[in-house]
């Protein structure tokens, strides 16, 4: 049975992890460049289920592609890094999903932008925090 | 007992920058985001934006874009905020929030020519 | 952006009074609001956050109800020291955001 100070660590990384996809939102749609309609062409995989932390394998492995698609963003007004900001994710939810059980993703049919999945992950973490708590 | 403690106040000429230190003591400095939030006299509370101090990435409000950097020191567990182009409306008390739970006593920054 | 409406913007009340105030969200938040007091010249205090959980040393007087785009802020019986402004706050997503404000006066 997970202990006070595991569910307590456990809130804490989601709670990083959730800042971390609503910064990489927020500085999306802050964009009123061209550069924001070509990072929307890029498709994502969603999650065809993700209610627990398992499911952050699904995450995980959108993450390069995540970061290819931030790295188009570069210029003086984004401020986010993509590699030290997916680096930082990427630590967050290796630690999260756990490495003892191997856990093969299934993926919805459907593809979405960025903006649908971040809101789908963030919305991820919102759930399984109001759990927590 | 976790503390946040902001430089002095400061008065400013139009156009010019100013920026403003948070000292964190008490807690592990990376533990928590910090946020940028400021009130002008008599009005509510604008939030500026949000820097994750282990990472040293930000991102601000579309208001701020262009205008705010958020920076940190991990050697001294302090995060800057500097605002250029300073204007009259930017008179404010700007205030540090780590986590929007503890707040710094805030910094008075007046804009006057 | 999501606006935060509260209501009223001022209200007068006596010590010992029940006391509530609303907040509305543009758009659905789930139960991610926090309530604050400020003092004149003070920072803002976290009373209560996830609508209802109140922040450790804050009295039970206070208490947090609401989801989705409605929510209260209730003084159960208001104190001297209660004299202050009351502000909402979403972090549902970026950027935060708060309401205008409600201060509450000695009748």
């Known amino acids: 049975a997970p202990t006070s100070s595991s569910t307590k660590k456990t809130q804490l990384q989601l709670e990083h992890l959730l800042l971390d996809l609503q910064m990489i939102l927020n500085g999306i749609n802050n964009y009123k460049n061209p550069k924001l309609t070509r990072m929307l062409t890029f498709k994502f995989y969603m999650p065809k289920k993700a209610t627990e932390l398992k499911h952050l394998q699904c995450l995980e492995e959108e993450l390069k592609p995540l970061e290819e698609v931030l790295n188009l963003a570069q210029s003086k007004n984004f401020h986010l890094r993509p590699r030290d900001l997916i680096s930082n994710i990427n630590v967050i939810v290796l630690e999260l999903k756990g490495s003892e059980t191997t856990f093969m993703c299934e993926y919805a049919d459907e593809t979405a932008t960025i903006v649908e999945f971040l809101n789908r992950w963030i919305t991820f973490c919102q759930s399984i925090i109001s759990t927590l708590t | 007992q976790v503390q946040l403690v902001q430089s002095g106040a400061e008065v400013k000429k139009p156009g010019a920058s100013v920026k403003v230190s948070c000292k964190a003591s008490?807690?592990?400095?990376?533990?928590?985001?910090m946020h940028w939030v400021r009130q002008a006299p008599g009005q509510g509370l604008e939030w500026m934006g949000i820097?994750?101090?282990?990472?040293?990435?930000?991102t601000y409000a579309q208001k701020f874009q262009g205008r705010v950097t958020m920076t940190r020191d991990t050697s001294t567990s302090t995060v800057y905020m500097e605002l250029s182009s300073l204007r009259s409306e930017d008179t404010a008390v700007y205030y540090c929030?780590?986590?929007?739970?503890?707040w710094g006593q805030g910094t008075l920054v007046t804009v006057s020519s | 952006d999501i606006q935060m409406t509260q209501s009223p913007s001022s209200l007068s009340a006596s010590v010992g009074d029940r006391v509530t105030i609303t907040c509305r969200a543009s758009?659905?938040?789930?139960?991610?609001l926090a309530w604050y007091q400020q003092k004149p010249g003070k920072a803002p205090k976290l009373l209560i956050y996830?609508?209802?959980t109140l922040e450790s040393g804050v009295p039970s007087r206070f208490s947090g109800s609401g989801s989705g785009t409605d929510f209260t802020l209730t003084i159960s019986s208001l104190q001297p020291e209660d004299f202050a402004t009351y502000y909402c706050?979403?972090?549902?997503?970026?950027?935060?955001?708060f309401g205008q404000g409600t201060k509450v006066e000695i009748k």
């Open positions: 706050q979403q972090s549902y997503r970026f950027p935060v955001t």
């Open positions: 008490g807690h592990t400095f990376t533990r928590y985001y």
């Open positions: 820097i994750n101090p282990s990472g040293g990435y930000a």
């Open positions: 996830a609508t209802s």
């Open positions: 929030a780590s986590g929007l739970f503890i």
């Open positions: 758009q659905s938040i789930n139960s991610w």
